[in-house]
């Protein structure tokens, strides 16, 4: 067990041309704060993928109000640490998520209105109880400075914080198979941390996290006794005879959840899903409010201004959760048209648009000859690959001002070949094809058994259907 | 993406006139080689007539001076006007538009001419 710290040193315009404008005006204030997420491993994971290794959220800054006319400077920050306490051993490799949110403070209807200024994200190496690394990230035209370390929680030590150390009992020596803590040589290794809720009489452990069990009990906490009865008794052993598995006291007997949490097993042992207002292993900590900022993502929280209210949050479009904590995949709809590239900003959906088409959801095919003239005789037709002008023989470019070989922009479709010729290009069109540039095919895949060919899209370069 | 919707179809007798028209979304006409393709019941699928990006057009000889394609950029349609029809100009009549931009091709439902007496 141990705890992630994170200290954010500034968070400010990033050098170069771009200043951002500041987040916070006169008829505006603002302040900000910062939500962490850690996730184990390398790996490259989804900004929604869970937050395994925990996360934790920050006190809000100083109110800020910017000087009219004076650049954004670095902003004031929170007080503090952000902590991030985790239960199992280190990972070593973490890959992090800092959110840089602005909370206004103007007159909006049902309380301050969140939202997302920046995003950084990254993957480190770090081992626990080292010293402070230091971090430099930019989102745009932002920068954000940080430090950040894991430290292990006494008695646990290690670069994993899986190793536990004790006061010796003895002065000289540690126990039977157990070695002196370095650096701390008065202390001892203790044992090896079993998996949490393992049974101290019935199961131990060779690795840390592990629960395995001495002969008769199973589980994954060695608290189910392996019992050859009958059966008839509903718990407990019976005579030895027909080689039955009764059930022991389960992890969720007695229902370990309070506040009115619900218990379900789980391969370690129990997990809790809490009421609104409550959280915790066992659902024991109460009084979140909104004041305590529980909604992610922007949501809006209602309700909650004391300890015995429930909170509501109010997610913005495109989260979800009782925290507005989980991401809708918006972009597995496909909103985007024309082949554009969706990209799911949070806050927004935006497409960026393959050339040649725009509006929010590239739904627009542009004029590409609106107001263009083209030079040397060359007419303004979209066509042709990339080209704005189907332009005179020997000429090419966006405009036809420049000397080209006509050929050159695969003027002829379905396969056809094109000869530059005195009087303009010619298309020799592919066997089944006809028109000046090979654009229609005479019988189009036609088997006379063919029923009518479904309406919509075919690849036509060369034509085929699907 | 292209979507190419044809109306006009019906019955006629023969000397008789109809005009198609095929209304297109998604890219302006202008930008497109559109064709009028006709299949009668048991045989492949023709080319009847076609107008390029450029607007010059192309004709089947069994169609050539009975049969005229245009185009109408405001509208953002093509139209195919059919004169002294014949029993054999009998077909679903298909819009075909082939987008240079993305050199693919694309197809209407399709719409019903029945030439008879």
């Known amino acids: 067990a141990g705890v992630f710290e994170l200290q954010i040193h500034s968070f400010g315009p990033g050098p170069g041309p771009g200043a951002p404008r500041s987040p916070c005006s006169a008829r505006l204030p603002c302040r900000l704060f910062f939500r962490v997420c850690l996730k184990p491993g390398l790996s490259e994971e989804a900004a929604e993928s869970p937050c395994a290794l925990g996360a934790a959220l920050s006190a809000r800054g100083p109110v800020y109000t910017e000087q009219p006319g004076a650049p954004a400077p670095d902003l004031p920050l929170p007080d503090g640490l952000l902590q991030v306490p985790f239960r199992d051993a280190w990972p070593g490799t973490f890959s992090f998520i800092i959110e840089t949110w602005r909370e206004e403070l103007g007159d909006q209807i049902g309380g301050p209105a969140w939202s997302l200024l920046a995003r950084v994200a990254g993957r480190r190496r770090l081992a626990a109880g080292g010293p402070w690394a230091r971090d430099i990230q930019r989102a745009g035209a932002w920068e954000l400075r940080f430090s950040y370390r894991a430290r292990c929680e006494p008695p646990a030590v290690g670069t994993a914080c899986t190793r536990l150390c004790r006061p010796r009992s003895a002065p000289s020596r540690c126990g039977p198979g157990l070695r002196p803590c370095a650096p701390l040589e008065d202390e001892c290794e203790a044992p090896l941390v079993c998996r949490a809720g393992c049974s101290p009489e019935h199961g131990f452990c060779e690795q840390p996290g592990e629960c395995r069990c001495l002969e008769g009990w199973t589980g994954p906490l060695c608290t189910v006794p392996v019992s050859t009865s009958s059966c008839l008794s509903p718990r407990g052993p019976s005579s030895a005879t027909t080689g039955c598995l009764v059930p022991g006291p389960g992890p969720c007997d007695g229902n370990p959840c309070a506040n009115g949490g619900s218990c379900s097993e789980t391969p370690r042992s129990f997990e809790c899903t809490c009421p609104r207002g409550f959280y915790g292993l066992r659902c024991e900590v109460s009084g979140v409010t909104c004041a305590d900022g529980p909604c992610f993502n922007g949501g809006l929280c209602v309700g909650g201004a004391d300890p015995d209210s429930a909170y509501i949050c109010h997610c913005p479009p495109g989260f979800q959760g009782s925290n507005c904590e989980k991401r809708v995949d918006r972009c597995s709809l496909q909103p985007c048209r024309n082949g554009g590239l969706c990209l799911d900003l949070g806050h927004a959906l935006r497409c960026r648009c393959r050339a040649g088409f725009a509006g929010p959801r590239c739904e627009h095919d542009l004029d590409d000859c609106a107001g263009r003239a083209c030079a040397n005789g060359g007419t303004c037709v979209e066509g042709g690959g990339a080209h704005r002008c189907s332009c005179a023989l020997g000429f090419g470019g966006r405009d036809c001002r420049e000397r080209a070989d006509p050929c050159a922009a695969r003027p002829c479709a379905h396969g056809g070949r094109c000869y530059a010729h005195f009087s303009g290009l010619v298309c020799a069109c592919a066997p089944g094809y006809m028109g000046a540039r090979c654009e229609f095919p005479v019988h189009p895949d036609g088997a006379s058994a063919l029923p009518a060919a479904p309406p919509g899209l075919r690849p036509g370069d060369p034509q085929r259907y699907l | 993406e292209v979507q190419l919707v044809e109306s006009g179809g019906g019955l006629v007798q023969p000397g008789g006139s109809l005009t198609l028209s095929c209304a297109a979304s998604?890219?302006?006409?202008?930008?497109?080689?559109m064709a009028w393709y006709r299949q009668a019941p048991g045989k492949k699928r023709e080319l009847v007539a076609g107008?390029?990006?450029?607007?010059?057009?192309i004709y089947i000889d069994s169609v050539k001076g009975r049969f005229t394609i245009s185009r109408d950029n405001a509208k953002n349609s093509v139209y195919l006007q059919m004169n002294s029809l014949r029993a054999e100009d009998t077909a679903v009549y298909y819009c075909?538009?082939?987008?240079?931009?993305?050199?693919?091709?694309?197809w209407g439902q399709g719409t019903l001419v029945t030439v008879s007496s």
């Open positions: 998604g890219s302006s006409v202008r930008f497109l080689s």
């Open positions: 107008i390029s990006a450029d607007g010059s057009t």
């Open positions: 075909y538009a082939y987008r240079w931009r993305t050199r693919y091709t694309y």
